[in-house]
Interface confidence: medium
Amino acid sequence: MALPTARPLLGSCGTPALGSLLFLLFSLGWVQPSRTLAGETGQEAAPLDGVLANPPNISSLSPRQLLGFPCAEVSGLSTERVRELAVALAQKNVKLSTEQLRCLAHRLSEPPEDLDALPLDLLLFLNPDAFSGPQACTRFFSRITKANVDLLPRGAPERQRLLPAALACWGVRGSLLSEADVRALGGLACDLPGRFVAESAEVLLPRLVSCPGPLDQDQQEAARAALQGGGPPYGPPSTWSVSTMDALRGLLPVLGQPIIRSIPQGIVAAWRQRSSRDPSWRQPERTILRPRFRREVEKTACPSGKKAREIDESLIFYKKWELEACVDAALLATQMDRVNAIPFTYEQLDVLKHKLDELYPQGYPESVIQHLGYLFLKMSPEDIRKWNVTSLETLKALLEVNKGHEMSPQVATLIDRFVKGRGQLDKDTLDTLTAFYPGYLCSLSPEELSSVPPSSIWAVRPQDLDTCDPRQLDVLYPKARLAFQNMNGSEYFVKIQSFLGGAPTEDLKALSQQNVSMDLATFMKLRTDAVLPLTVAEVQKLLGPHVEGLKAEERHRPVRDWILRQRQDDLDTLGLGLQGGIPNGYLVLDLSMQEALSGTPCLLGPGPVLTVLALLLASTLA
């Protein structure tokens, strides 16, 4: 934008100076626009190119034209013009920066009469000594209570002079305050020193709850002592309820170990659960940690007195940004075993995870992994792939966290890392995994199962094999046979029974000679190709008293296929009414090449089984 020819500042005349000021409003962009005006609507300041030539009345300028001004220009204006500008800014609700407010206040040297017409926050920068009479000070401080005191940092001279002046104005002597005094002080009550907190806890603590900034050391100690003393309004911590915790929300960070330990544990847990589910009660929190920490986290200083010396329960009351700023990652790593005992919210666990990620970018050491506890639920499979987990105790500790849930991708990755790290699926590992995930074994491929040593089979329970398919049982059965080979008949059958879905015909024939009384459920899981060659007599011996169950299963494999291969005469000897066998006088010729090649008979497919009616010779009939 081209700058027009400069004109002299005429001070009391005001017009040329004002024109210059208004032009610079936009060109220097020195002010933060009101959120309602520009910040959120995307509006920008209007250019002021024509203002110098035709300076309008200040009050006729639009909010967009009042977005900024430099202090140097204000210093050239008359007090009257400064007041006019201040009033216009208030009317248009233009939000000014601290520097601009300070600048305006400095130029309003005489105490303004029309306090109500000025921007509320401007009053914070006026000298309270200028309003010394009882009426003047009352009017001044009544307005101040509505201003945003936190525009000024605690140490700012303007803020420091307000509290003593306010106390004097309201006639407060000593440190004892009434409810009306606290109300009259407004935001300045947050600056009251610890002695006031100690003597006026009943009326002051509920006000301190909503103070936006952290309390100073002196205030914290006084608040802690008052709360621990168990006086009104909150009573002894041992009697606190969830609603007490809600009411105390802003003071929770100052609670020490003794107080936290004396609150009923169930109350703390219930409150944490509720507040993490429904955070509507919380004060708006500075969004310092960006979502999921995907970008660099803004570094914010830890408030004084909040630096964590150890990982303990007091941290549950820290906001996310305070955890980030006040908890040292190395301290966290050495005291990970304590984290699981503390009811952190998932949001807080995110912060702790981020700290560990920064400390160990290549992956956590196993001494930390073993103590992750619920923080494990925050890990991604990508995080876990960086780990080297070889201790079964570590695996067990992490599986415990996920207990009762389906196997998550995280758990699957963890198990995979563990098994690869150990080099084999040994008995203790299998014992652990199947205890947590009965279906674990059946989730492995036949190739993975081949690395299971026979000794590990002792850890397998029948329910662990419920979801295994025949290909998996084909791999596991020979291992089980080897593992149980030294057991006697009945004990051997009990152990081998759940693996029999992988057994060949010859083993089934051998079992039929041992009076094992196989139940129908086991029989129905046998390989069809292993059952087909069994004779009726062998099946009868194999099933014992359970043979009667064949009738109910005659339409299902492998019973259906087996019946079709048996002579009807033989089936009739069972007395079960099984139908579908080969009638007398029929000859079965199995011409299937497929069975010879693959070992899988295709008895009822198109063509492979040829049933030939043999004509009985007349001479034989004769």
Partner: nanobody, 123 residues
Framework: QVQLVESGGGLVQPGGSLRLSCAAS????????MGWARQVPGQGLEWVSG???????YYADSVKGRFTISRDNAKNTVYLQMNSLKPEDTAVYYC?????????????????WGQGTQVTVSS
């Protein structure tokens, strides 16, 4: 067959030092965490220290700063250097695979265990 053989125990005066060794065989040593636990007669097992396959370590609070665990993968051996011994360190010390810690159940520890070596601290 996993075998763990401890050595180095004995009688020592308070303030003295001992170095326990545990020779391991029958498994891929470098792939396993190793640890030391101890048992006072009539009491349960207490994990003292552990060293994982990645070399990271932990110690029970009662021995932090006094005991140091280390491993030599080439020799399939894990060591426990015990300094500033106290009478309350008197116990049978066991070498074990799959070290746990105070947060894991000790009544039914996993892994394999050695026969133990007696450490007595007394004046």
């Amino acid at each position: 067959q996993v075998q763990l053989v401890e050595s180095g125990g004995g009688l020592v005066q308070p303030g003295g030092s001992l170095r326990l060794s545990c020779a391991a065989s029958g498994f891929t040593f470098r792939n396993y965490g190793m640890g030391w636990a101890r048992q006072v007669p009539g009491q349960g097992l207490e994990w003292v220290s552990g060293i994982f396959s990645d070399g990271s370590t932990y110690y029970a609070d009662s021995v932090k700063g006094r005991f140091t665990i280390s491993r030599d993968n080439a020799k399939n051996t894990v060591y426990l250097q015990m300094n500033s011994l106290k009478p309350e360190d008197t116990a049978v010390y066991y070498c074990a695979t799959d070290p746990g810690s105070g947060t894991t159940t000790l009544h039914r520890p996993f892994g394999s265990w050695g026969q133990g070596t007696q450490v007595t601290v007394s004046s």
